[in-house]
């Protein structure tokens, strides 16, 4: 058998780091038996046998120009073996971050924090962690560990299914080369790092006979479970073309009607998505629908103002992307106090 | 030899913006994190922001957080800093440094001075 | 983020004399801590890694100790050149921070 430790990595490579003193081991003899060494294609002897280092061969402070092919062979002229030399740095330990677009899952994405210049590999998992005591504040490491599946195709992500809202999670990301392992833990709890996709499905229609409303409407995002518990909010902006300040409006539901548009002019709107009791951050925006405003031609009959009405949220349909969830507040009224000088004009 | 060069400072109005370049060399600047401390004038040392090697991932103070972005050209060994809506606050001595495991700051450039006043 | 403490904030010292600056961060570290000495008008130099390591060319009257929250940083006989402002510093997380720092002068 090799008297050769293997590393992890490629077969008949060994390694060393730049500036360190490095032995390479010569495969095919026995331990201890006297060997000489060559460089590949080069006659010049590097190390006798009468070295005193048996089948190892010794450079101090190897460098770049160390790297390449070493042939061994042994006191009868027969191939000890050959050994490629690769010079690298042991891993740092990486950036790792974690996000969640849901409440039920969460991927970690990781990068080297240095490179190493070896062949590495990333070992993955979590613990969830539990308070120690009812008494205590301490928090440790309790049930796991598990793997965190990682993406196939090489992606530098792994995802974590079926984690629970509340629990908080240490996760383990290592980066292994030939040189060693290095170790980065990072807790994350779901409350923090939940950031769902933004809405989709935004809509921007205008209203007849009002040249100043646009109704928006959207829906909750795709990879949003479909279950009621936990329930998104909203952040609608919008403002007429060629204008640099958005206005924003917080909905009460999956609609908003625009009351204060600019007659006349495309409006470009956005909406973002946030849990409703605000853990985590906003989703990024979703991208901007645009509409006009109608022209505002006067409706067959506009009833009395006393006479308007509301009407209740339309509940989505069971196929909808959004979730059946319950009707936070009815539409936004189709006239309120800042209409009077819209509806003047309508009228006139 | 082994550097790092730091320009882009002066003096800025509060609200305005400033992109600082740090220029490395003498070592193989696409294989090492790169970040930015500052040091506000008498005052100590306040990390500001790191990038990894391939820029994938950014990291930064709270205090910086959606004003300043950090990026890095491996091409032209070049870390940036670009800075928008600075306060007086911002005012500081900007250094460059060059990290072993993300926070061990081995080398370091001599800073530009950023001053936010009106 | 993990605060980190600093005492003395300044200390006077003669030539000769062993100085000791402590630092205290507000969790545990896992031994991912620097010191730094900065002089005037200079950018920072790093002397201690990991607590204990001394940096490539330091000289080794610089030395570390401590783990988890509490750390010593000692100058065994304290020379002219090492007036300056030492700051500790932790890794231990992927947002470092500085304790105060520490100005030494000779008396």
């Known amino acids: 058998s090799s008297p050769c430790p293997q590393a992890w990595g490629p077969p008949g490579v060994q390694y060393g780091q730049p500036g360190r003193s490095v032995k390479l081991c010569c495969p095919g003899v026995t331990a201890g038996d006297p060997v000489s060494w060559f460089r590949d294609g080069e006659p010049k002897l590097l190390q006798g046998p009468d070295s005193g280092l048996g089948h190892e061969l010794v450079l101090a402070q190897a460098d770049s120009t160390d790297e390449g092919t070493y042939i061994c062979q042994t006191l009868d002229g027969a191939l000890g073996g050959t050994v490629t030399l690769q010079l690298g740095y042991p891993p740092a330990r990486p950036v790792v971050s974690c996000q969640a677009a849901d409440y039920e899952n969460f991927s970690c994405t990781w990068s080297p924090s240095q490179i190493s210049g070896l062949p590495t590999r990333y070992l993955t998992s979590y613990r969830k962690k539990t308070v120690l005591g009812a008494d205590s504040q301490r928090r440790s490491p309790s049930t796991g560990p598990w793997p965190c599946p990682q993406d196939p195709l090489g992606a530098a992500r792994c995802v974590v299914h079926g984690a629970e809202f509340w629990s908080q999670y240490r996760i383990n990301v290592t980066e292994v080369n030939p040189l060693g392992a290095s170790t980065r833990l990072l807790d994350v709890s779901l409350q923090s790092i939940l950031r769902p996709d933004p809405p989709q499905g935004l809509r921007v229609e205008s209203v007849p006979g009002y040249p100043r409303r646009l109704r928006a409407s959207w829906t909750y995002p795709a990879s949003w479970p479909c279950q009621p518990h936990f329930l998104l909010k909203f952040r609608l902006q919008y403002r007429p073309a060629q204008h640099p300040a958005w206005s924003t409006v917080e909905p009460a539901g999956l609609e908003e009607v625009i009351t204060d548009a600019v007659a006349g002019l495309p409006h470009a709107v956005r909406v973002s998505a946030r849990d409703f009791l605000d853990a985590g951050t906003w989703s990024t925006w979703s991208p901007e629908a645009w509409g006009t405003p109608s022209t505002g031609t006067i409706p067959k009959e506009i009833p009395a103002w006393g006479q308007l009405h509301t009407q209740p949220e339309v509940e989505p349909q069971v196929d909808s992307p959004a979730p059946p969830r319950p009707s936070l507040q009815p539409h936004p009224r189709l006239l309120d106090h800042r209409d009077s000088v819209e509806q003047v004009a309508v009228l006139a | 030899e082994v550097q790092l060069l730091e320009s882009g400072g002066g003096l800025v109005q509060p609200g305005g913006s400033l992109r600082l370049s740090c220029a490395a060399s003498?070592?193989?600047?696409?294989?090492?994190?790169m970040t930015w401390v500052r040091q506000a004038p008498g005052k100590g040392l306040e990390w500001v922001s790191s990038?990894?090697?391939?820029?994938?991932?950014?990291q930064y103070a709270d205090s910086v957080k959606g004003r300043f972005t950090i990026s890095r050209d491996n091409s032209k060994n070049t870390l940036y800093l670009q800075m928008n809506s600075l306060r007086a606050e911002d005012t500081a001595v900007y250094y460059c440094?060059?990290?072993?495991?993300?926070?061990?700051?081995?080398?370091w450039g001599r800073g530009t001075l950023v001053t936010v006043s009106s | 983020d993990i605060q980190m403490t600093q005492s003395p904030s300044s200390l006077s010292a003669s030539v000769g004399d062993r100085v000791t600056i402590t630092c205290q961060a507000s969790?545990?570290?896992?031994?991912?801590l620097n010191w730094y000495q900065q002089k005037p008008g200079k950018a920072p130099k790093l002397l201690i890694y990991?607590?204990?390591n001394l940096q490539t060319g330091v000289p080794s009257r610089f030395s570390g100790s401590g783990s988890g929250t509490d750390f010593t940083f000692t100058i065994s006989s304290l020379q002219p050149e090492d007036i300056a402002t030492y700051y500790c510093?932790?890794?231990?997380?992927?947002?470092?921070?500085f304790g105060p720092g520490t100005k030494v002068d000779i008396k």
């Open positions: 440094a060059k990290p072993v495991d993300w926070g061990r700051f081995d080398l």
């Open positions: 003498g070592f193989t600047f696409s294989w090492y994190s």
């Open positions: 990038i990894v090697p391939s820029g994938g991932h950014t």
């Open positions: 969790q545990d570290i896992n031994n991912y």
């Open positions: 990991d607590a204990s």
């Open positions: 510093q932790q890794y231990d997380n992927l947002s470092p921070t």
